[in-house]
Amino acid sequence: SERCDDWGLDTMRQIQVFEDEPARIKCPLFEHFLKFNYSTAHSAGLTLIWYWTRQDRDLEEPINFRLPENRISKEKDVLWFRPTLLNDTGNYTCMLRNTTYCSKVAFPLEVVQKDSCFNSPMKLPVHKLYIEYGIQRITCPNVDGYFPSSVKPTITWYMGCYKIQNFNNVIPEGMNLSFLIALISNNGNYTCVVTYPENGRTFHLTRTLTVKVVGSPKNAVPPVIHSPNDHVVYEKEPGEELLIPCTVYFSFLMDSRNEVWWTIDGKKPDDITIDVTINESISHSRTEDETRTQILSIKKVTSEDLKRSYVCHARSAKGEVAKAAKVKQKVPAPRYTVELACGFGAT
């Protein structure tokens, strides 16, 4: 056959669906690879063809669209499973072609089993809620297009294994779940089960997401440098190791980039000739505030190094701060026999 633009296996779109539930999978060609949509392609006389490779097999085979009750079907650029089976797992390819044009992409589809408490190997999306921040909502994700607007599904929400009813600060409101005031105790996995009828059959859609309660913007402050500070003086003799920690606290800020860096005499350590190493460690609070520590180390400090200016800098979306370390050369203790004796006029 003629050459086909092959976009390969699109592992970025690792699609996971639950066993025994409906799944609608759009051909990724129109979403991520081509500059036109399915309607335009269809009007231009292009045909969309689907095929697949079963798990642990190399053989590409056509998808059987003649299964009982149309279990697998195609509608425009969507491949439908009503419902999925475990052995539908594999790599699926959609190919758009006519006599003069061809483009195709493959993507992995994994059919996943869940237990009665909705635990599964499914990768869960994370939704962040601000702590004590007034009413916030999460919405049952990825249920659009499964049923027409005329169908009124029933939606049941769970936290972990518990059906959400009479929770003191969490209220189910159809497709939404409202948190009147988010607390740390609201951290966890939330599942919505959407039940709807179709052609005399009942289908269930299960969607689980992780709620993570994070620091509120009300509590957010610019970076706080805990070390270096005015109480600690780094007093060293030449030849000793100089270790100065820069410890900075960052409030949680959505999508903020937290940065810590040292300057020595106003220059970045990479831009100067002295032998400096910097080691960084990061810890996070339960509400995703961050503490970064960068330890500046000079193995064998010289008297010149002890005269330099060592400044710790920190930056977040809330602002930029800097603090200089107090570094000085230790005055050697007097040697009694020579120096003190001289003071008494001894020669």
Partner: antibody, heavy 119, light 108 residues
Amino acid sequence: QEQLVESGGGLVQPEGSLTLTCKASGFDFSSNYYMCWVRQAPGKGLELIACIYTNSGNTWSASWAKGRFTISKTSSTTVTLQMTSLTAADTATYFCARDLNYPDTSNLWGQGTLVTVSS
Amino acid sequence: DIVMTQTPASVEAAVGGTVTIKCQASQSIGYYLAWYQQKPGQPPKLLISRASTLASGVPSRFKGSGSGTQFTLTISDLESADVATYYCQSYYNSDSDAFGGGTEVVVK
């Protein structure tokens, strides 16, 4: 009114075992509360033993408590602490406490139950 | 493991006076520090969270301050009802959950 009540304390022989129970009233464990056991030896300070997230079941234990002390959720309103190989050093009042992981919002303590390890 | 060091172990002050209790963390814990008051035969009672936020019903004579590794609880206009043992508690994350050793406050 939200309340925690500890029970199961008493006199136990050295090397013996004991299970303490913390019963919640006015709320249940469907929300992901962080329930902890804290002990206090006579005339001494507070010592955190172990904690459990009541919804997910994830647990945390102090390094010294691992192996001898086990925290569990046994119902939607009870948390237990199983203690084994007890010694005189384990003599203390054992408190059940809620949300020590973020006391800002819903910190709650029980009155405690006394455990005496003696022959 | 984190170590919370409280000083002094005991402090004596006159009614109407001021008491200062210090708590030092062995690693930075941001603002994640709580203070508790415990009277004999009772469980601890939360006074202050997030280093400086007063719990509901706690009089403004109690003041918390500090961040990082150094924290202070100040009790001003001391009353006889303030006779108790005071504990700090770190709650930055599960690696830093710990109580300080306690400070006994005695009225002269």
